[in-house]
C-alpha cells in the first residue's frame, strides 16, 4: 500500500495535507534536506487559506518556506508554478538585497513576523515548515 491515509505522529492535518512545524532553526538548504528525509518538502503555499493556517501555527517568527530563486527565477520546491500561483510578499519584496554584507543577494523566501513574505540570505538559521500531501504516500498499508 502506498497511499498515506493519515498524518504521521506530531504532524498537523489540514485540507488533505500534513504539516510539521520546527521549533529550532536551520539554513534553508538544511531545512529542505530535513523535509526530504521526512518524505516531504518545505511548505508550498497555494492559497490565502493555507497562508492563514500556516501563519496561525508559526506565530510571529521568521520561518522558511519552499520557495527560492537560487537558480534564477523564483521556484516552488514541488514544481507548483510561481508566476500564476498565490503570492504574499511584503511591499517592495522580493528585493534581492545585497547590503547585508554576507555576500551575494537574497535567494530564499520566508514568512516574516506578520506572515507576509520576504527574501533573505539562505544561510540564516530560521525555523521551517514541512508539508506532505495525503494519499500520496503512506506509512501503513491499507486494511484489506
Amino acid at each position: 500500500g502506498s497511499e498515506r491515509t493519515c498524518c504521521p505522529v506530531n504532524w498537523v492535518e489540514h485540507e488533505r495535507s500534513c504539516y510539521w512545524f520546527s521549533r529550532s532553526g536551520k539554513a534553508w538548504a538544511d531545512a529542505d534536506n530535513y523535509c526530504r528525509l521526512e518524505d516531504a518538502h518545505l511548505v508550498v503555499v497555494t492559497s490565502w487559506e493555507e497562508q492563514k493556517f500556516v501563519q496561525h501555527h508559526i506565530g510571529p517568527v521568521n520561518t522558511w518556506m519552499g520557495l527560492h530563486d537560487q537558480n534564477g527565477p523564483w521556484k516552488w520546491v514541488d514544481g507548483t508554478d510561481y508566476e500564476t500561483g498565490f503570492k504574499n510578499w511584503r511591499p517592495e519584496q522580493p528585493d534581492d538585497w545585497y547590503g547585508h554584507g554576507l555576500g551575494g543577494g537574497e535567494d530564499c523566501a520566508h514568512f516574516t513576523d506578520d506572515g507576509r513574505w520576504n527574501d533573505d540570505v539562505c544561510q540564516r538559521p530560521y525555523r521551517w515548515v514541512c508539508e506532505t500531501e495525503l494519499d500520496k504516500a503512506s506509512q501503513e498499508p491499507p486494511l484489506l
Epitope: V9, S24, K26, A27, D30, Y34, L37, D39, Q139, E140
Partner: antibody, heavy 116, light 107 residues
C-alpha cells in the same frame, strides 16, 4: 524496544562489492529514516548515508558517493547498503541506526574487511 | 564539512568524580548536537540529543549544555559503568560529523 540486526559483512578484495543488510523489529520501520555509520578499527565514528522512511530521498558522505547505494524494503523491514569499488579505507564495522538526526537504536555492527 | 573537536581526548577520573567533556563546532550549529557513549566491542548509545535533552532511560547524572559552537557533556558523579568513550555529533548540516571521541578512564 526497537532492535536492529546487521548482516552481510566479510572479507572482500579491493575493487570488489558487498551488500549489507539491516533487519529491524520493535518499531514501525517505514515511519523512520535510517542511517549507516561506520567505524574503522581503533578509530572514531563516521556517518555514511541516510534514507527517508519511504525511500524517496537519500544522502551520502563524499567518501562513498558514487560507490555506495542505500536502499530499503519496507515490506521486509530491511535496510541495505550496496558497496561497490571497495577500497582498503572502507574497512570498518558498519552500523545501521534509526532516524535521521540522531540515532536512538543501533545494530551490533558487521565487520567489512577490504584486503588483498 | 563541520569539524567537531572534543577535549580532552582522554580523562582519568575516579568513581564519584564530576567529569566534563567539551565539544566545539567549526561553525554555529544552534542546538543540533547529540552525545553518545560507546563501550569496547559495542554499538554507541545515545545519551543526549538537541544539546540538552536527556534520552529516555539514560541516568540523570548525564547532562548536556551549550549552543552555537560550544557544548558540554557533564557526568555529575561518575559510576563504574560510565568508563567508556564519548562522542559528540552535529546534525545541523550534511554530512553529519562526529567528534574524535573522549576516553574516560579509571584513575
Amino acid at each position: 524496544e526497537g532492535q536492529l540486526l546487521e548482516s552481510g559483512g566479510g572479507l572482500v578484495q579491493p575493487g570488489g562489492s558487498l551488500r549489507l543488510s539491516c533487519t529491524a523489529s520493535g518499531f514501525t520501520f517505514s515511519t523512520f529514516a535510517m542511517t549507516w555509520v561506520r567505524q574503522a578499527p581503533g578509530r572514531g565514528l563516521e556517518w555514511v548515508s541516510v534514507i527517508s522512511g519511504r525511500g524517496g530521498s537519500s544522502f551520502y558522505a563524499d567518501s562513498v558517493k558514487g560507490r555506495f547505494t542505500i536502499s530499503r524494503d519496507n515490506t521486509k523491514n530491511t535496510l541495505y547498503l550496496q558497496m561497490n569499488s571497495l577500497r582498503a579505507e572502507d574497512t570498518a564495522v558498519y552500523y545501521c541506526a534509526k532516524d535521521q538526526l540522531w540515532f536512538d537504536y543501533w545494530g551490533q555492527g558487521t565487520l567489512v574487511t577490504v584486503s588483498s | 564539512d563541520i569539524l567537531m573537536t572534543q577535549s580532552p581526548s582522554s580523562v582519568s577520573a575516579s568513581v564519584g568524580d564530576r567529569v566534563t567533556i567539551t565539544c566545539r563546532a567549526s561553525q554555529g550549529i544552534i542546538n543540533w548536537l547529540a552525545w553518545y557513549q560507546q563501550k569496547p566491542g559495542k554499538a554507541p548509545k545515545l545519551l543526549i540529543y538537541a544539546a540538552s535533552s536527556l534520552q529516555s532511560g539514560v541516568p540523570s547524572r548525564f547532562s548536556g549544555s551549550g549552543s552555537g559552537t560550544d557544548f558540554t557533556l557533564t557526568i555529575s558523579s561518575l559510576q563504574p559503568e560510565d568508563f567508556a568513550i564519548y562522542y559528540c555529533q552535529q546534525a545541523n548540516s550534511f554530512p553529519w560529523t562526529f567528534g574524535q571521541g573522549t576516553k574516560v578512564e579509571i584513575k
